[in-house]
Interface confidence: medium
Amino acid sequence: KFSKQSWGLENEALIVRCPRQGKPSYTVDWYYSQTNKSIPTQERNRVFASGQLLKFLPAAVADSGIYTCIVRSPTFNRTGYANVTIYKKQSDCNVPDYLMYSTVSGSEKNSKIYCPTIDLYNWTAPLEWFKNCQALQGSRYRAHKSFLVIDNVMTEDAGDYTCKFIHNENGANYSVTATRSFTVKDEQGFSLFPVIGAPAQNEIKEVEIGKNANLTCSACFGKGTQFLAAVLWQLNGTKITDFGEPRIQQEEGQNQSFSNGLACLDMVLRIADVKEEDLLLQYDCLALNLHGLRRHTVRLSRKNPIDHHS
C-alpha cells in the first residue's frame, strides 16, 4: 500500500518523494532495501537524501532498486517504499510505455497538459515541450508555468507530449524529461464540406446606381467548434484587399449558431455608391475549411425604376 513506482532516465535528475507523509519537522531516514545501507544526506554524493526527498543527481541504471524511507516522530515510525527504475536513454524517438506518466484528456474547453512530477524539482520557466519528439511550434501552443495549453484542440493533437526542464541543485544543472499521452475527447462535434446558405449559386442581385449595396456570404461548416473555417469575398478572382477599390470593403459578421447547432459564419460585402462598372464584376462568395472550398458566384444588375403608370 505504501509503495510507489518511480522511474527516470540515466544521466537525468530524478527526485523521489517518500510515499509516507509526515510533518516537515519529522526526520526521514532512507535506506537501500537490498543492503539495508543508509543513504547519506551529504549533497556531495550523487545519490543523497533530503528529508522526504531522495535525489539522484544524476541517475544511473545501477541505481534501480527498492528504497525504504522511515518517517520518524516522537510517538511513531512510518515506513514507505520507493521502487525506482532507471532506464537507458532510447536512441530513437519512441517513448516506451514504461516511461509514460498518466494519460490526460482534453477538449476544446480544457486542453491543459501538466508536466508530471515537476513540483518535486527546483526549476525555472519556461519548459520545453515536444510532441512525438518534435519541438512544438506555432501560436496554438501556449506554455505557461508548469503546463501547456493548446488552442482550438482537434483530434490531430492527440499524441505523446514531453516536457523538458532543468533542475538546479547548488548551482549545478541537471536535465529532466517527462512524457505523458494526451487524448482528445469527442464533444460530438463534426465538420462538413462547407455549405453556402447565401447567396444562391449564380444569383443576380439588383442594385441601384449611386446607392449603397450589401452582399452577404453565409456558410455553415459543421457542428461545434471548427478549427479552420472562413468565408470571404473575391472580386474577379482577387482578394478584396488586393483589388484596390476603397468603395468595396468586406466586414466580418458575427458567428451564428442556428437551431440545429451548426457552426456558421457571415461575411458582408459593402459596396458604397454603386457605379456602372461594378455591374461588370464577378462577385465570388468563398467558404473554406479543412474539407475544401466552395464558391458561389453573384452578379449585379441594375434595378429598373418603378413604373408608376402601370
Epitope: K109, N110, K112, A125, P126, L127, E128, A135, L136, Q137, G138, S139, R140, R142, A143, H144, K145, V149, D151, E251, E252, Q254, N255, L265
Partner: antibody, heavy 116, light 107 residues
C-alpha cells in the same frame, strides 16, 4: 474594419484603483484571445495579461499578479482590466490587443498616471 | 523568463539603405517570434509574425527570418516612413517578452 478602443485611463493616487475597458468591433471577439500590453513613458513594451476566448485561461505578468484582474464580456465585445493597489511604476500607456500569439491589431492606448 | 535582446539599440541610415535588426532569445523559441513597428505617440503595428510571415498590408521590403534563438528583421530599401522604433516579441512561453527596441533614425 477591425478596431479596438481603450478607455478608462486617468490620474490616480498610489494605492488607488482604475478599470480600463477595450471595445472591440469588426471581428468575432468571442473567438479570440485578448491581451493588455503597457508602455511606460520613454520605455519599451511590457506584456501585462492575456485571457482566452472563453475566459478559461488567464495569465499575468509577475509585476501585476494579485493586483490586476483581466476579464471579458463576449456579449458586449469588451475586454477589461481592473487595476488595484496601483503604484508609481504602473504609470504607462495601456494598450489592448487581439492575441493570436502575435498582437494585431492594437488599440490607440489609454494613459494611466499614478502620482500623488 | 525568456529574455529578448535586440541589436543594435539604435542606428542611423539613409533612404534606400538596406537595414538589418537582430533579435536573440535567451533560449530556443521555435518560430514564435513577431516584429512590430512603433512611431512616436502611436500604437505598435505588426509587421512580421511566426518569424517570417509578412502581415497583410505591410510592404514587401520588410522581411523576417530565423528560428530557434536568432532572428532578423530586414528592410531591403529604407523609405522615409520607415523611421521608427522596432520591437521583437516572443510568444513561446508566458510571460511574453519584448526586445528593448531598435530606433531607426535618419542619417
Amino acid at each position: 474594419e477591425v478596431q479596438l478602443l481603450e478607455s478608462g485611463g486617468g490620474l490616480v493616487q498610489p494605492g488607488g484603483s482604475l478599470r480600463l475597458s477595450c471595445a472591440a468591433s469588426g471581428f468575432t471577439f468571442s473567438s479570440y484571445w485578448m491581451s493588455w500590453v503597457r508602455q511606460a513613458p520613454g520605455k519599451g513594451l511590457e506584456w501585462v495579461s492575456s485571457i482566452s476566448s472563453s475566459s478559461s485561461y488567464i495569465y499575468y505578468a509577475d509585476s501585476v499578479k494579485g493586483r490586476f484582474t483581466i476579464s471579458r464580456d463576449n456579449s458586449k465585445n469588451t475586454l477589461y482590466l481592473q487595476m488595484n493597489s496601483l503604484r508609481a511604476e504602473d504609470t504607462a500607456v495601456y494598450y489592448c490587443a487581439r492575441d493570436q500569439g502575435w498582437f494585431d491589431p492594437w488599440g490607440q492606448g489609454t494613459l494611466v498616471t499614478v502620482s500623488s | 523568463d525568456i529574455q529578448m535582446t535586440q541589436s543594435p539599440s539604435s542606428l542611423s541610415a539613409s533612404v534606400g539603405d538596406r537595414v538589418t535588426i537582430t533579435c536573440r532569445a535567451s533560449r530556443a523559441i521555435g518560430n514564435n517570434l513577431s516584429w512590430y513597428q512603433q512611431k512616436p505617440g502611436k500604437a505598435p503595428k505588426l509587421l512580421i509574425y511566426t518569424a517570417s510571415s509578412l502581415q497583410s498590408g505591410v510592404p514587401s521590403r520588410f522581411s523576417g527570418s530565423g528560428s530557434g534563438t536568432d532572428f532578423t528583421l530586414t528592410i531591403s530599401s529604407l523609405q522615409p516612413e520607415d523611421f521608427a522604433t522596432y520591437y521583437c516579441q516572443q510568444s513561446y512561453s508566458t510571460p511574453y517578452t519584448f526586445g528593448q527596441g531598435t530606433k531607426v533614425e535618419i542619417k
